[in-house]
Interface confidence: low
């Protein structure tokens, strides 16, 4: 039959060339003379001339050595024609398979591979993968099958078999426990790739395994006990710097310290922060400490890291004994602002109140007193007892110094400490009204016509407070009632002045006595200008000129 089985040809053949491979033969050669030819890549198209055929015998010829890694298979067509050139057979497919020889070594894809793994990981943890390639065939032969191995490990601590490599995949894994970055931060592995599945040619490369830091070391206080001295009342005062050591990677979260006050800070007086460079714990006062309340605080501080521990570690604690130092504290008036009710106008020398301060310090310090601000100069203060007395007339109606019935005084207390300290207090005297002002009419000058005069309404004011004010009473004195009448309205807060007899144009004094609800009397002279006119007038008209 006009067929040919696939032909296998080893690569790198020795020859001699041309080398006969197979014979094409058509059974039509019994009837007529047959001529054979081949076409296709490797015959009449690139790469031309690798194969040829003996025209008359049909022998397929190989003209030179083959390279499987260049072309692994050739597909040609065989033709048979008669002498007159007529085709006697359909074109026949000829497959030539190039079989592999182990003519290539493995090649790693990199000279140096880098990988990393956390310290302290369990055996079996994958680190990295390395890859080597081999151009030879790995499907039908072992020529291109690469097997990986570790040739050497440096350093050999804690022993020389810390890693293994999967012979087929090139995956490097941890095989032993004991990876400790603090002891060995990096391993250098010399790795091999060998073809023929480990029995052939070998090539080498380097795998560098970086051991990454894990938080497997707790920060430790050094020292663990501290004594500190802090003045009382100081806020934001640096009490103590706590020092820790940590074997983990500096400036990493596994190294950076986190401090926590675990006990002893009952009143939330302290705070602790981490210094960004030194990693020290800076203990400071959040609130002022009080020597008199508690002169010693014992704090327990725990240190951990920003990163969580990767295994259960005993944490370090420090004990800080904080001694509070006594400071001479200022006397404090009790209360800081004292309200006292006192009648206005009390006699000079009369006691107003006693206003004293307490000294927070435990020693029996002597406190002396004086007035710091007394705008009207109405008061004096005994330096020893804090007794406040009147030395001037307290006047509730004095608008310059009294606001809303209150006279404000500032007093000072000074202790005899070294150096002495002072405290101030505010004394608010609420002045109780006394009926010391009579009613006063407004206005005190009027203009009125002597014919059909309009009644004059005068407002009554009294500086005192109720009940020392309205209702008011009015009375005319010194014969003013001959020509005038004075009547208080129903509300009792205005007086109506009326002219009851004719007076010639002139200016007159009207003597008006007003008294308040407490019968405090006040005499006022009203200047009345009487005009020659009718009804309402504001100023007297000029003299009448007839025509």
């Amino acid at each position: 039959d006009w067929v040919v089985a696939p032909i296998s040809v080893p690569e790198n053949g020795k020859g001699p060339f041309p080398q006969r491979l197979n014979q094409l033969k058509s059974n039509k050669d019994r009837d007529t003379k047959i001529f054979y030819s081949i076409t296709g890549p490797g015959a009449d198209s690139p790469p031309e001339g690798v194969f040829a055929v003996e025209k008359e015998t049909g022998w397929l010829l190989l003209n030179k050595p083959l390279d499987r890694e260049e072309i692994a298979k050739y597909e040609l067509f065989g033709h048979a024609v008669s002498e007159n050139g007529a085709s006697v057979e359909d074109p026949m497919n000829i497959s030539i398979i190039v079989t592999d020889q182990n003519d290539h070594k493995p090649k790693f894809t990199q000279d140096t591979f880098r990988g990393s793994v956390l310290e302290g990981v369990l055996p079996g943890t994958s680190v990295m993968q390395v890859t080597a390639t081999d151009e030879d065939d790995a499907i039908y032969t072992y020529n291109g099958v690469v097997a990986y191995s570790i040739h050497s490990q440096e350093p050999k601590d804690p022993h020389d078999l810390m890693f293994t490599i999967h012979r087929s995949t090139g995956t490097i894994s941890v095989i032993s426990s004991g990876l400790d970055r603090e002891k060995v931060p990096e391993y250098t592995l010399t790795i091999q790739a060998t073809d023929m599945d480990g029995d052939g040619s070998t090539t080498t490369a380097v795998a560098v395994v970086e051991i990454l830091d894990a938080n497997d070391n707790a920060p430790m206080f050094d020292p663990q006990k501290y004594e500190a001295h802090v003045p009382e009342n100081a806020v934001g005062h640096e009490v103590q710097r706590l020092t820790v050591t940590d074997l983990d990677a500096p400036n990493s979260p596994a190294w950076r310290a986190t401090y926590l006050i675990m006990g002893g800070d009952d009143g939330d007086h302290f705070t602790i922060t981490t210094h960004p460079e030194s990693n020290q714990g800076i203990l400071t006062t959040r609130k002022g400490l009080d020597f008199e309340a508690k002169n010693q605080h014992t704090l327990y501080v725990e240190v951990t890291n920003e990163a969580p521990f990767v295994l259960k570690l005993p944490t370090s604690t420090a004990t800080i004994v904080v001694h509070v130092e006594d400071v001479n504290e200022a006397p404090v008036f009790v209360p800081p602002s004292k309200v006292v009710e006192v009648q206005e106008g009390i006699p000079t020398g009369e006691p107003v109140c006693v206003y004293t301060a307490e000294d927070p310090d435990k020693e029996n310090q002597k406190i002396s007193y004086r007035i710091l601000r007394d705008p009207a100069g109405w008061l004096a203060m005994d330096p020893d007892s804090g007794q406040v007395t009147a030395v001037g007339t307290l006047d509730r109606e004095d608008e310059q110094f009294v606001r809303n019935n209150i006279y404000e005084v500032m007093v000072l207390a000074m202790d005899n400490g070294s150096p002495p300290t002072t405290g101030t207090g505010t004394l608010l005297l609420t002045l109780i009204d006394v009926n010391d002002h009579g009613p006063v009419p407004e206005p005190r000058q009027i203009t009125i016509c002597n014919q059909s005069p309009v009644r004059q309404v005068l407002n009554i004011t009294d500086k005192d407070l109720s009940p020392h004010t309205s209702p008011f009473q009015a009375q005319l004195t010194d014969d003013s009632d001959i020509y005038w009448t004075a009547e208080v309205n129903e509300e009792g807060d205005t007086v109506v002045l009326s002219l009851k007899k004719f007076l010639k144009q002139d200016t007159y004094d009207v003597h008006l006595s007003l008294s308040d609800h407490g019968n405090k009397e006040q005499l006022t002279v009203i200047r009345a200008t009487v005009c020659d006119c009718h009804g309402h007038v504001e100023t007297c008209p000029g003299p009448w000129k007839g025509g």
Epitope: T258, L260, G263, Y300, T304, E306, P314, T315
Partner: antibody, heavy 123, light 113 residues
Framework: QVQLQESGPGLVKPSETLSLTCTVS????????INWIRQPPGKGLEWIGV???????NYNPSLKSRVTISVDTSKNQFSLKLSSVTAADTAVYYC?????????????????WGQGTLVTVSS | DIVMTQSPASLAVSLGERATINCKSS????????????LAWYQQKPGQPPKLLIY???TRESGVPDRFSGSGSGTDFTLTISSLQAEDVAVYYC?????????FGQGTKLEIK
Amino acid sequence: QVQLQESGPGLVKPSETLSLTCTVSGVSITSYPINWIRQPPGKGLEWIGVIWTGGGTNYNPSLKSRVTISVDTSKNQFSLKLSSVTAADTAVYYCARSRGVYDFDGRGAMDYWGQGTLVTVSS
Amino acid sequence: DIVMTQSPASLAVSLGERATINCKSSQSLLYSSNQKNYLAWYQQKPGQPPKLLIYWASTRESGVPDRFSGSGSGTDFTLTISSLQAEDVAVYYCQQYYSYPYTFGQGTKLEIK
């Protein structure tokens, strides 16, 4: 099996001192912090204080002036003393073990509790 | 002191239904150095001491049925009972152990509808 058992007088007179003990079995007494908690009848839980494994204590500020927690390792017992009691101190008192984050540390959820003992303050 | 606020004060849920209890703290209970939330949940039945259900906000205590779960971080936490059983009727408390004094929520009474 870890067990805690509170004991003490069920009736205390006003102004006197309430004294309770907590006996621990099944675990080393110095291994974990011990808390005291109380619960007035029909009400919620109030933490009284803790004693750490090293013997240090921390108390609730609301009771601090009146409370003392101590340990007697020879008897495997913890004690609670609350002075100047009033009717407001009537409650079931529990002792409970903290799970412990670290060995010295009193912080932690309370995983083992005693059955509690009712203390009534009345004359 | 850290104030713990539970809601609701009482809750009635049908058997087999989901029950959810909330707990809010007045400050964060997340501790930066170990990324743990210092919160526990307890169950208390009448005449008995409280029983620890959940710690570290979401870790179930050994022997606690898996229908109980805890979630949340910082200041907001939740206890969930996925399918209520008759034996779950109790008062539930949250508790912070982030800082002294330890404080509890006021409790949530869970009943069957």
